[in-house]
C-alpha cells in the first residue's frame, strides 16, 4: 500500500500557502507543492524556491534547504581566497592559500574550510613560520632550517658566555609571533646587580640579585611626589642607566619660623596646608633680622618649601667680642648672619694659625668663635740637650725636635724627642737625665699601697700615689718623687684607735651618744666616754675626753 | 744560670692556706727584676698572681689581692706566697718566674721554676 | 682587664709547613708590652718573643712576632718536630698581667 506524505516540516523554510494548504494532508505520491528557503539556505539547485515532491519514500528532496556560506564571513588575515563564487552551499569546500612566509597551522602553504550546517567549519589561519634565528654569542643544537608553530629550537652559549644567571644552555619556542626570544648569551661581567634605591620611590618590581644586560626596571614615586627623569633604567654593561628623581609636590605646612612668627599667626593656623604661590607676613624677634635686614618680611610657599628657608637671621653685636692682646678696627656695631668681621693682634702675639689677623664670622648662634691672640714660642731653654732645627720663634702646633747629649736619655733608652709649642707655651721642657738619676719601684710603706701598677724603672721627677688602708691615716705627703736616683719620703699610715667593748667595760665607762660594740677613732680625733649607770668618775673631767695618738688612747675611770 | 725552685706541700685543705717558696739560685734576688708568681689550673691556661721587687715593693692581681701576700727573704735569697681561704678552685700548678732586664719599664719573663702541683681537697 | 683572644685554637700542620698564629685584644695594647710563649706538656712556659717582635735568647729565627694595637701575630717560617706545642701570647704593660687562652700547633 502506498504511504501518503504528512505535512512537510521544512527546517530553514517552508511552503508557500502552507496554512491553506495543510488542510489537503496528508497528501498522496506523486503529488508536488512548491516552497521557499529562509535568508542564507538555498534548494538543492541552489534557487531560493522550488517544488518538493511526495514520493514511495516520503518527501523529496529530503533537506529541502541547504545551509550557504558567504565569502565575506571569512576574514583571512596574511592570506586569501582565489576562487570567484561568492556563495557556498553546505559542505562545499573552498581553498585558500597563505601568503610567503606564512602558514596554516599544520604548517602548510594552503588550506581549506567547509561550509557547514552552522557555516564556516573554521576561520582559516595563516601564522608565520620561524626561520632559524640569528644567533648571539651561541650556536644551534641542531640542523633545521624553519619551524613550525609550537617547535622548540635548543640552542647552547660559546665559551666564557652564560645565557641567564649561569645557564650555558637554553631553548627557543617558534610562536605565532615568531621565536619566543632571541638565542643570545651574554658575558657574565655585563651584567648588573639589583638597581639602585631613590628618596621617596621604588622600583614597581620587586628586585632581583643578577639582571641580564638590556633588563629593564620601573620606578614609582610615593605619594605627593613627582617622577623627574624616565621611569625606566636600563643594564647596561654591568650598571645601570640613570635613575629618575622623586620631586616633592606636598603643599607648605604651617611654617615653624625659628627666632620669628606669622603675624596673626593663631587666626591663620587653620587654614593650613596652603598651596605653593602664596605669601604671608612674618616679623622676626630680637637679635634677628630678615635676609633682607629688615625686622619684618614676607614668606612665601614655593614648590621647593618656604622661602627663605632661614626667614630670621642672626645678628651679632661688636660688643660681644673680647679681645686680648689685639683690637678690631671696623666702625659698624651690628653684623648679620655669614657677615665676617677683621681682627688684628698686637706684635709679638698672633692667632692660633699663627698670623698676625684673623676673621670671625657671625653665626646662628653668635660669634663663630672668640678670637684669640696667643703668644708665640721662642726657642726653650735646653737641659742636657740641643735643638735638631735652626728656628728661633714657633707658631702654635710648631714641633720642636731635640736630642740628648752622650751619656744622657729622655726615657728608657730614648735619646731623641720631640716639644710642641702649645697656648701655654712649651708642651715640656727639653730635659734629658742621666741614666744613673732614674729610680726602681717606690718603697713599700706598713698599711698602705701604691694607687698605681708599679714599673722597674722611672725617670727622674716621676711621682707615684700612696693610699692607706680603712682606717689608717696617712701622715706625710700621698706621693713621691723620684729624685737623683731616689725615691722622696714616703708617707706613713698610722695606726687608728680601736676603742673595744672590753677595755670599756674594765674602766665601767662607755662611748658618750654612741653604742657601738667597737669604734674607731683616727690619731687626732676626740673620744667622750660617760661612766656607766651607778658609776662615778675616777679620774680627772678631761681624761673623759680621750685623744687618739697613733694607735693609744687613754681611758678614763669610774668606780 | 739563674735557676728557680718552687716547693711548698701538695695538699692543702679548703678554706686552709696556700704557702708556697720559690729559690733562687745562680744569682741574686737583688738585682733589677720582678719575682712573680703564675699558677695553671689543670688542661688550661695560666694566670699571674703576683710579683715582688727586692724593695719589698708588689703588684698583686686584683682579682686575688685580698687573699694573696707575697715576701722576700734577701738572706735566704728567696721568696714566698701565701693565699689564703683555698677553694678547689685553687687547683693547679704552681710556677714562680722572674722578668728579663731590657731598660724597659716592663719586662716579659724569661726564667721559670719547673712548677709544683698544688692540690686542694679535704 | 685587657682579654687576649687567641685563634684557632688548634692548628694541624706537617713538619716544614709555616704556622701562623693570632692573638686579638679586648683594647689597644703597647706593642712595647706583648709577649709569646711556648709550653710543652708537664713543662714550664717559655719566652720566644717580648716587645712584640724581639726574639728571646737562644729563640730560632724561625719564629717571628709582629702586630700593633689590638692585632698581633706569631708565625713559624719552617715547622720542626720540635715545634709542636702550646703556644700563649701575654701582654705585660698594666695590671693585670694576661694570658690568651693558647693555640695548640699538632701534627697533621
Known amino acids: 500500500e502506498v504511504k501518503p506524505c504528512d505535512f512537510p516540516e521544512i527546517q530553514h523554510g517552508g511552503l508557500y500557502y502552507k496554512s491553506l494548504r495543510r488542510l489537503y494532508f496528508p497528501a498522496a505520491a506523486g503529488q508536488s507543492y512548491s516552497y521557499y528557503c529562509d535568508q542564507n539556505f538555498v534548494t538543492p539547485s541552489g534557487s531560493y524556491w522550488d517544488y518538493i515532491h511526495c514520493t514511495q519514500d516520503g518527501w523529496s528532496p529530503t533537506v529541502p534547504c541547504l545551509r550557504t556560506c558567504s565569502k565575506s564571513d571569512v576574514e583571512i588575515e596574511n592570506g586569501f581566497i582565489s576562487e570567484s563564487s561568492s556563495i557556498y552551499i553546505l559542505n562545499e569546500e573552498t581553498q585558500y592559500n597563505c601568503k610567503p612566509g606564512y602558514a596554516t597551522a599544520e604548517g602548510n602553504s594552503s588550506g581549506s574550510i567547509t561550509c557547514l550546517q552552522n557555516g564556516w567549519s573554521t576561520q582559516p589561519i595563516c601564522i608565520k613560520f620561524c626561520d632559524m634565528p640569528v644567533f648571539e654569542n651561541s650556536r644551534a643544537k641542531s640542523n633545521g632550517m624553519w619551524f613550525k608553530l609550537h617547535d622548540t629550537l635548543d640552542y647552547e652559549c660559546y665559551d666564557g658566555y652564560e645565557s641567564s644567571y649561569g645557564n650555558t644552555t637554553d631553548s627557543i619556542v617558534c610562536g605565532e609571533d615568531g621565536w619566543s626570544h632571541l638565542p643570545t648569551c651574554y658575558n657574565s661581567s655585563e651584567n648588573c646587580g639589583p638597581p639602585p634605591p631613590i628618596s621617596n620611590g621604588d622600583t614597581t618590581s620587586f628586585p632581583q640579585k643578577v639582571y641580564l644586560p638590556w633588563s629593564r626596571v620601573e620606578y614609582q614615586c610615593q605619594s605627593y611626589y613627582e617622577l623627574q627623569g624616565s621611569k625606566y633604567v636600563t643594564c647596561s654593561n654591568g650598571d645601570w642607566s640613570e635613575p629618575p628623581r622623586c620631586i616633592s609636590m606636598k603643599p607648605c605646612e604651617f611654617p615653624e619660623i625659628q627666632h620669628g612668627h606669622l603675624y596673626y599667626e593663631n587666626t591663620r593656623r587653620p587654614y593650613f596646608p596652603v598651596a605653593t604661590g602664596q605669601s604671608y607676613s612674618y616679623y622676626c624677634d630680637q637679635n634677628f633680622v630678615t635676609p633682607s635686614g629688615s625686622y619684618w618680611d614676607y614668606i612665601h610657599c614655593t614648590q621647593d618649601g618656604w622661602l627663605p628657608t632661614v626667614p630670621c637671621l642672626r645678628t651679632c653685636s661688636k660688643s660681644d667680642i673680647e679681645i686680648e692682646n689685639g683690637f678690631i678696627s671696623e666702625s659698624s656695631s651690628i653684623y648679620i648672619l655669614n657677615k665676617e668681621i677683621q681682627y688684628k693682634c698686637k706684635p709679638g702675639y698672633a692667632t692660633a694659625d699663627g698670623n698676625s689677623s684673623g676673621s670671625i664670622t657671625c653665626l646662628q648662634n653668635g660669634w663663630s668663635a672668640q678670637p684669640i691672640c696667643i703668644k708665640f714660642c721662642d726657642m726653650p731653654v735646653f737641659e742636657n740637650s740641643r735643638a735638631k732645627s735652626n728656628g728661633m720663634r714657633f707658631k702654635l702646633h710648631d714641633t720642636l725636635d731635640y736630642e740628648c747629649y752622650d751619656g744622657y736619655e729622655i726615657s728608657y733608652g730614648n735619646t731623641t724627642g720631640s716639644i710642641v709649642c702649645g697656648e701655654d707655651g712649651w708642651s715640656h721642657f727639653p730635659t734629658c737625665y742621666n741614666s744613673s738619676e732614674k729610680c726602681g719601684p717606690p718603697p713599700p710603706i706598713s698599711n698602705g699601697d701604691t694607687t698605681s701598677f708599679l714599673l722597674k724603672v722611672y725617670v727622674p721627677q716621676s711621682r707615684v700615689e700612696y693610699q692607706c688602708q680603712s682606717y689608717y691615716e696617712l701622715q706625710g705627703s700621698n706621693y713621691v718623687t723620684c729624685s737623683n736616683g731616689e725615691w722622696s719620703e714616703p708617707p706613713r699610715c698610722i695606726h687608728p684607735c680601736i676603742i673595744t667593748e672590753e677595755n670599756m667595760n674594765k674602766n665601767n665607762i662607755q662611748l658618750k651618744g654612741k653604742s657601738d660594740i667597737k669604734y674607731y677613732a683616727k690619731t687626732g680625733d676626740t673620744i667622750e666616754f660617760m661612766c656607766k649607770l651607778g658609776y662615778n668618775a675616777n679620774t680627772s673631767v678631761l681624761s673623759f675626753q680621750a685623744v687618739c695618738r697613733e694607735g693609744i688612747v687613754e681611758y678614763p675611770r669610774c668606780e | 744560670q739563674v735557676q728557680l725552685q718552687e716547693s711548698g706541700p701538695g695538699l692543702v685543705k679548703p678554706s686552709g692556706t696556700l704557702s708556697l717558696t720559690c729559690a733562687v739560685s745562680?744569682?741574686?734576688?737583688?738585682?733589677?727584676?720582678?719575682w712573680s708568681w703564675f699558677r695553671q689550673p689543670p688542661g688550661k691556661g695560666l694566670e699571674w698572681i703576683g710579683e715582688?721587687?727586692?724593695?719589698?715593693?708588689?703588684n698583686k692581681n686584683p682579682s686575688l689581692k685580698s687573699r694573696v701576700t707575697i715576701s722576700l727573704d734577701k738572706s735566704k735569697n728567696q721568696f714566698s706566697l701565701r693565699l689564703r681561704s683555698v677553694t678547689d678552685a685553687d687547683t693547679a700548678v704552681y710556677y714562680c718566674?722572674?722578668?728579663?732586664?731590657?731598660?724597659?719599664?716592663?719586662?716579659?719573663?724569661?726564667?721559670w721554676g719547673q712548677g709544683t702541683m698544688v692540690t686542694v681537697s679535704s | 682587664e685587657i682579654v687576649l683572644t687567641q685563634s684557632p685554637g688548634t692548628l694541624s700542620l706537617s713538619p716544614g709547613e709555616r704556622a701562623t698564629l693570632s692573638c686579638r685584644a679586648s683594647?689597644?695594647?703597647?706593642?712595647?708590652?706583648l709577649a709569646w710563649y711556648q709550653q710543652k706538656p708537664g713543662q714550664a712556659p717559655r719566652l720566644l718573643i717580648y716587645?712584640?717582635?724581639s726574639r728571646a735568647t737562644g729563640i730560632p729565627d724561625r719564629f717571628s712576632g709582629s702586630g700593633s694595637g689590638t692585632d698581633f701575630t706569631l708565625t713559624i717560617s719552617r715547622l720542626e718536630p720540635e715545634d709542636f706545642a702550646v703556644y700563649y701570647c701575654?701582654?705585660?704593660?698594666?695590671?693585670?698581667?694576661?694570658f690568651g687562652g693558647g693555640t695548640k700547633v699538632e701534627i697533621k
Open positions: 718566674a722572674r722578668d728579663q732586664y731590657t731598660g724597659s719599664p716592663r719586662d716579659a719573663f724569661d726564667i
Open positions: 745562680g744569682g741574686s734576688i737583688s738585682g733589677s727584676h720582678w
Open positions: 715582688i721587687y727586692h724593695t719589698g715593693s708588689t
Open positions: 683594647q689597644s695594647v703597647s706593642s712595647s708590652y
Open positions: 716587645g712584640a717582635s
Open positions: 701575654q701582654h705585660y704593660g698594666n695590671s693585670p698581667l694576661t
